[in-house]
């Protein structure tokens, strides 16, 4: 058997091109230079490698730069990213964003990877913070990413990024994150008139606290049924009945509908039936006419 | 002289897992890679899948989730962990060496183990 | 998705005839090829790679052909020990293929 370490006469490599994917594997790993790859990466995807001819290119670049790809070579993976593990990635140092929009190029149409989240992982701790250029590539690729972020990582995220963000960017997320995300929102969008800054701070209205919900009842924001049940229960349930009708406007109807269900159903229980009754709604569970309403958490506030 | 005697076979239950171990003498595991193919009663060569040189693994279609193939240099060992078994994973398992000393499965399998029986039944 | 058909499926010969096996593959596989003898309740032999060498100790009434799609494996002069199934492999795409190998071929006394 003839030893197959050593590279055939006449088969080294001179450029990466289509003759290659006739070469076996062990030929690919004795025949190209791994310098050689790396500066003609960008060739790789062009050529229709097997699965296993891509694994012998990655373990030659893995022994040409054992301490991790510089990003030259990182910009041009294309589909040689999907084989690096979350241990490789973790060794780049990714700076640039057209390389980031390169290899979530090659990803687009899958759910986020862990190799994916390694890479913005990175991306997002060299640059220090979630700017808005990387928000609005981060949610183009994921418009799930800002929900898979913790409150804490979140707070990173400058009021100026929040431009960036559409509604289904945050169908996902948690009142916890929408607690960190609105005040940025608010802050964002303050310079805007009452329409306009409605429809901005919609999505973002989880998050939004008592006296802002209050605020809101008193501009004629006509806000859906849907936008209301997202709504923290403990900022629902100080707003009286006028103000709750002044928020919903005409959508107050689909009360009813959500009787049963949070907030809708914590906020009646702490109304006067009578109020309720006001409504027209048919609505049930308020506190019955000549009982007092004693507020406990008022009470031991003051003790 | 390479030699490759597979163990662990046996009787199992549908659902049950099963480990197959390959020992392997006269050659050493990060110079070649190492496959494994069953066959089951009166039926063709079924390949499973292989482990490279560098430990990078590939699968049939089929095997992929339920099937996994590691290696052990040290102990001079290749394994075949096979979860969630069926009746029809009974078979022969064969564990074969890739016949090319260059790490990959480029030449085909040489030499083959004598295989191990495993029977899915309940 | 790679795939290999052989034919026949089985073939009935007399000691000193020529037989040919044919194989198949779905789409080009250059020369990656083997073919592989197996006699019943024993492992495979390996018999030609790159379809058409001889691997070691193998006799040279085999002989493999062929590149691309089509490949055939001949056995110039039948001999008593080569009633067996024989089996073709592709070794171009060994990830997310159904099979490698052929469906096998019996050659059988006739």
């Known amino acids: 058997e003839v030893e197959k370490t050593a590279c055939p006469s006449g088969k080294k490599a001179r450029e990466i091109d289509e003759s290659l994917i006739f070469y076996k594997k062990w030929e690919l790993e004795a025949c190209v230079d791994a310098a050689l790859l790396a500066t003609q990466m960008d060739r790789v995807n062009a050529i229709p490698f097997t699965y296993e001819q891509l694994d012998v290119l990655k373990h030659k670049l893995d022994e040409l730069y054992p301490q991790g790809y510089p990003e030259s070579v990182i910009q041009h993976l294309g589909y040689l990213f999907l084989k690096m593990s979350p241990e490789d990635i973790r060794k780049w140092n990714v700076t640039s964003l057209e390389t980031l929009k390169a290899l979530l190029e090659v990803n687009k149409g899958h759910e986020m990877s862990p190799q994916v989240a390694t890479l913005i992982d990175r991306f997002v701790k060299g640059r220090g913070q979630l700017d808005k250029d990387t928000l609005d590539t981060l949610t183009a690729f994921y418009p799930g990413y800002l929900c898979s972020l913790s409150p804490e990582e979140l707070s990173s995220v400058p009021p100026s990024s929040i431009w960036a963000v559409r509604p289904q960017d945050l169908d996902t997320c948690d009142p916890r994150q929408l607690d960190v995300l609105y005040p940025k929102a608010r802050l964002a969008f303050q310079n805007m008139n009452g329409s306009e800054y409605f429809v901005k701070i919609q999505s973002f209205l989880g998050g939004a606290p008592t006296e802002d919900l209050k605020a809101l009842s008193q501009q004629n924001v006509s806000m859906d049924l849907a936008t209301f049940m997202k709504l923290r229960t403990d900022a629902v349930l100080p707003l009286t009945v006028a103000e709750v009708q002044k928020l919903l406007g005409p959508h107050v109807e689909g009360l009813k509908a959500e009787e049963r269900h949070r907030p809708v159903r914590d906020w009646i229980l702490r109304q006067r039936q009578d109020d309720l009754d006001t409504l027209g709604l048919g609505l049930q569970g308020g506190i019955p006419n000549g009982y007092l309403v004693l507020d406990l958490s008022m009470q031991e506030a003051l003790s | 002289q390479s030699q490759l005697v597979e163990s662990g076979g046996g009787l199992v239950q549908p659902g049950g897992s099963l480990r197959l171990s390959c020992a392997v003498s006269?050659?050493?595991?990060?110079?070649?890679?190492m496959g494994w193919v069953r066959q089951a009663p009166g039926k063709g060569l079924e390949y499973i899948g292989y482990i490279s040189k560098i430990g990078t693994t590939y699968y049939a279609s089929w095997a992929k989730g339920r099937f996994t193939i590691s290696k052990d240099n040290s102990k001079n060992t290749v394994y075949l962990q096979m979860n969630s078994l069926r009746a029809e994973d009974t078979a022969v398992y064969f564990c074969?060496?890739?016949?090319?000393?260059?790490?990959?499965?480029?030449?085909?399998?040489?030499?083959w183990g004598q295989g191990t029986l495993v029977t899915v039944s309940s | 998705a790679l795939q290999m058909t052989q034919s026949p499926s089985s073939l009935s010969a007399r000691v000193g005839d020529r037989v040919t096996i044919k194989c198949q593959a779905s789409q080009s596989i250059s020369n990656y090829l083997a073919w592989y003898q197996q006699k019943p309740g024993k492992p495979p032999k390996f018999l030609i790679y790159d379809a058409s060498d001889l691997a070691s100790g193998v006799p040279s009434r085999f002989s493999g052909s062929g590149s691309g799609r089509d490949f055939t494996l001949t056995i110039s002069s039948l001999q008593p020990e080569d009633f067996a199934t024989y089996y073709c492999q592709q070794v171009y795409d060994s990830n997310n293929v159904e099979n490698v190998f052929g469906t096998g071929t019996k050659v059988t006394v006739l």
């Open positions: 074969a060496r890739g016949s090319s000393s260059g790490g990959y499965l480029d030449d085909g399998f040489d030499p």
């Open positions: 006269g050659f050493s595991l990060s110079s070649y890679a």
